[in-house]
Interface confidence: medium
């Protein structure tokens, strides 16, 4: 019998510095460019190698960003949120939604022991 | 995408006040705006107001009688009308900005990017 997949949702404060590249993502999502069906938020897209997120360690390709600097990004245009991203300062706080994925063992079993049974 | 939706016009008597309601969706962090056009004449600009809800401006015709305000939380702006004269019949039209976060306040239906589709307000 197979695992079912479950969803953890959790949420972060994110404090990254800006470096000399940015803050090292790339994001998609507005209420012009639908990332999710009918959900108009703001998504990471991309994490780039050696730049200030990825460095940082916590956002995730795929993670959810509520606000920045306590600023909702609840029904922006994509390049409002770009724009909101650039102006955004040196140091910026962001809150996050992670989505995990958690892979549930066979309905029944609970216990811990060897995978292979 | 992006939906401007007035609400609130109606008919009212000389004296009387009304409140004109704009829901809006799909955008943010705008300027927001209140335009007005009588039959036969062009649209003309009423009150602004910034997109922080800090700073307001109106059209001399209206000063003392009108108060633009928005709750950025329920994404609404409002016109609240009061002593209300027959020249103030017209179609009554929300707009937004169409610079993002701008610092000043426009008063020129060019900078407006958004459009409802108006409300009506007669005064009788």
């Known amino acids: 019998m197979n695992g079912r997949v479950d969803y953890l949702v959790t949420e972060e404060e994110i404090n990254l510095t800006r470096g000399p590249s940015g803050l090292g993502f790339n994001i998609v999502g507005g209420t012009d460019q639908q990332y999710v069906s009918n959900d108009s938020g703001i998504y990471v897209s991309r994490i780039k190698e050696n730049g200030a997120a990825a460095l940082d360690g916590r956002l995730q390709e795929g993670d959810k960003i509520l606000s920045v600097n306590g600023q909702d990004l609840k029904n922006l245009l994509h390049q409002d949120a770009v724009d909101l991203f650039r102006n955004a300062g040196y140091a910026v706080s962001l809150r996050v939604q992670h989505r995990l994925q958690v892979q549930n063992g066979p309905i029944g079993h609970r216990g811990e022991g060897d995978p292979s049974g | 995408q992006v939906q401007l939706v007035e609400s609130g016009g109606g008919l009212v008597q000389a004296g009387g006040s009304l409140r004109l309601s704009c829901a809006v969706s799909?955008?943010?962090?705008?300027?927001m705006g209140w335009f007005r056009q009588a039959p036969g004449k062009e649209r003309e600009f009423v009150a602004a107001i910034s997109w922080s809800g800090d700073s307001t401006v109106y059209a001399d015709a209206v000063k003392g009688r009108v108060t633009i305000s928005r709750d950025n939380a329920k994404n609404t702006v409002y016109l609240e009308m009061n002593s209300l004269k027959p020249e103030d019949t017209a179609v009554y039209y929300c707009?937004?900005?169409?610079?993002?976060?701008?610092?000043?306040?426009?008063?020129?239906?060019?900078?407006?990017?958004?459009w409802g589709q108006g409300t009506q307000v007669t005064v009788s």
């Open positions: 707009a937004a900005d169409g610079r993002f976060r701008a610092g000043e306040i426009g008063t020129s239906l060019g900078l407006y990017r958004y």
């Open positions: 799909g955008v943010s962090f705008r300027n």
